[in-house]
Interface confidence: low
């Protein structure tokens, strides 16, 4: 070609028109072009319709082209990657109809001040979205609803002051979230759902440490090894997790995860209390991590946040209380349970030896606590036995978390899903509205027998028991190559709730409570 360099690369025809001072698409490009580089030209405006003759085009680079307007007309049915970074776009064109197969969209370093409702409608295949370095102040609710396959999301270096509570709902594959260097002061309750988010970048925001930050504090404590600092140009091997990088703006850079929350209401102090989200509890088996989450429930509120699943985990999980007002998507309901006045569910249950086993109905037969644990090979899909795992006596981190082994830093922004295999089974859909059960019933749902050999409470001691406790069904899957230390935090802190259904604790659980 007289202007551009044409190369055959595997089954692709790659055309490199970079840095040619072009003001328009060069004529007579090969019709079977699959990859087209138009970077660093002076296009100013560009119409995607001009590319319609190139029916095999899978990748288009239009970065650094001084673009102020991108016209979206026609359809490029197989275009998977579009790089619009480092331009002058002030609005994001609606690409869904034109680019139905798009998997990577990079609009970093433009001049976007807002995104329209439905900005991503039609982009159901999108896996990576980079919006770093724009001027976004808010995001429309439901922005990412059309992109359930999203894996990497960069919103770093914008002017975001708040995030929609349900922004991440349904993003079961999300592994990297970059929110650093914004103007965020809090994270809405339930924001992270039950996702396992391996790479989160949250530093450089003016976090306001007050009672509203307690949900975020708890999430940071439970995900300390997944919080990183973005350092441009630093070798990946030097990158370690750094949860202390997330700092209170109003407390002399005090780490948010250590914020004491003194004076914040606890359950029983105020009627309008709320929940933490459910977090995954993990224990390791050789080089595998088995993720198990268990639900215990004292229902007083209807919790309607739809939880995303990571791989094929159950949506049920351990939870703990969170003082604050109702989530926007929650509605207050009549209290369904009344506990004795002296019952203060502000306790922690450390399960030093705990066994979960699936049973068809509740039983009152004691289950002896195991004293040794045998490693179990790859669990069958219906297997729900959790081997005993030593549990630390303190459930929350009190010192700087140890750096996790050299973990990849996200790319341009990111792309660090290292070499983790794809999930082998489709996650079950997660319900969005739980059905409240007016009458305590447990006979119809599978239960878990819990044998706890030692119980520790902050203020009282009592006899241990092997009396079985009936809990909601817990499922577990094996996730290879998540190299994390074993932990089973069996923590019950007060008010617990499930997003899936509404079982009550077995009445025998009264005997484990400090009276």
């Amino acid at each position: 070609h007289p202007i551009c360099e044409v190369s055959k690369v595997a089954s692709h025809l790659e055309v490199n028109c970079d840095k040619r001072n072009l003001t328009a698409l060069p004529p007579d490009l090969p019709k079977d072009t699959t990859i087209l580089h138009l970077s660093e030209n002076l296009l100013y405006t560009f119409s995607l319709a001009t590319l319609m003759p190139y029916t095999r085009l899978t990748q288009l680079n239009l970065d650094r082209c001084e673009l102020t307007k991108l016209q979206v007309d026609g359809t490029l049915p197989v275009l998977g990657t579009l790089d619009l970074s480092h331009n002058q776009l002030q609005s994001l064109p609606l690409l869904g109809q034109t680019l139905p197969a798009l998997t990577v969209l990079d609009v970093s370093f433009n001049r976007l001040t807002s995104l329209p409702l439905g900005a991503l409608r039609g982009l159901g295949e999108l896996q990576e979205l980079y919006l770093k370095g724009n001027e976004l102040k808010t995001l429309p609710p439901g922005l990412l609803t059309p992109t359930p396959k999203l894996e990497k999301l960069s919103l770093a270096n914008n002017n975001l002051t708040e995030l929609p509570a349900g922004l991440l709902n349904g993003l079961e594959n999300l592994d990297t979230l970059l929110l650093q260097e914004n103007s965020l002061y809090t994270i809405p309750k339930g924001f992270f759902g039950s996702h396992l988010l391996p790479f989160a970048f949250l530093h450089g925001n003016p976090w306001l440490c007050n009672c509203e930050i307690l949900y975020f504090r708890r999430w940071l404590q439970d995900n300390a090894e997944n919080v990183y600092v973005w350092k441009q140009g630093v070798d990946v091997k030097a990158m370690t997790s750094n949860v202390a990088s997330v700092q209170c703006d109003n407390s002399d850079k005090f780490p948010v995860y250590k914020y004491p929350g003194k004076g914040c209401p606890t359950l029983g102090d105020e009627g309008d209390t709320d929940l933490y989200d459910y977090y995954p509890e993990e224990d390791t088996e050789g080089d595998k991590v088995r993720a198990t989450r268990t639900v215990v429930k004292f229902p007083t509120k209807a919790h309607t946040t739809p939880w995303g699943l990571f791989y094929s985990w159950s949506t049920a999980s351990l939870d703990s209380q969170m003082p604050s007002s109702l989530h926007p998507t929650q509605e207050s309901t009549k209290e369904q349970t009344t506990f004795p006045p002296r019952w203060t569910p502000n306790f922690t249950l450390h399960m030093e030896s705990i066994t979960f086993s699936k049973t068809p109905k509740s039983t009152t037969e004691p289950t002896p606590s195991p004293t040794t644990s045998e490693p179990v090979p790859e669990p069958a899909p219906n297997m729900t036995t959790l081997e005993p795992t030593p549990s630390p006596t303190t459930p929350e981190p009190t010192s700087e978390p140890a750096p996790s082994p050299t973990t990849p830093e996200p790319t341009s922004e990111p792309a660090p899903s290292p070499t983790t295999p794809e999930p082998t089974s489709e996650p079950a859909p997660s319900p969005t509205t739980p059905e409240p059960t007016p009458i305590p019933t447990i006979a119809t749902s599978p239960t878990i027998l819990v044998s706890a050999t030692s119980l520790i409470t902050p203020k009282s001691t009592f006899l241990t028991t092997t009396k079985p406790v009936s809990l909601l069904e817990s499922t577990k899957k094996t996730i290879p190559e998540l190299d994390q230390p074993p932990k089973l935090r069996g923590v019950l802190q007060g008010h617990l709730e499930s997003s899936r259904n509404d079982p009550f604790l077995h009445p025998d659980f009264c005997c484990l409570l400090p009276l």
């Epitope: 190369s7 990859i35 990079d106 990946v236 990111p414």
Partner: nanobody, 124 residues
Framework: EVQLVESGGGLVQAGGSLRLSCAAS????????MGWFRQAPGKERDFVAG????????YYADSVKGRFTISRDNALNTVYLQMNSLKPEDTAAYYC?????????????????WGKGTLVTVSS
């Protein structure tokens, strides 16, 4: 600036296997699309395989499909090329390549950084 250093080349009999490694140093290598090229004596440098930043997407030249596998370990800043069922026509100097712009396959004209190469000789 990224420095790329290849290793693992050598002499192998036809039908044998080799694993090439490309160790990268400098800026964050997970920012880069990585690839392998090869240049047989007296011939042009040809694309062999390419891999996305996350390692999820991979592309191969038709001549190596099914025999070669590209992979990367971002934690170790290393890209690998596992070469099985080697043939005498695979004899060449193998070069590691890195490119920052988006895209998995690339012509050598779009490579930002090259390694110095490692020699693979397949004897019949």
């Amino acid at each position: 600036e990224v420095q790329l250093v290849e290793s693992g080349g050598g002499l192998v009999q036809a039908g044998g296997s080799l694993r090439l490694s490309c160790a990268a140093s400098g800026p964050t290598v997970s920012n880069y699309y990585m690839g392998w090229f090869r240049q047989a004596p007296g011939k042009e440098r040809d694309f062999v395989a390419g891999i996305s930043r996350s390692g999820v997407e991979k592309y191969y030249a038709d001549s190596v499909k099914g025999r070669f596998t590209i992979s990367r370990d971002n934690a170790l800043n290393t890209v690998y090329l596992q070469m099985n069922s080697l043939k005498p026509e695979d004899t060449a100097a193998y070069y590691c390549a890195a490119r920052e712009r988006v895209g998995i396959t690339f012509a050598h004209s779009t490579v930002d950084y090259w390694g110095k190469g490692t020699l693979v000789t397949v004897s019949s």
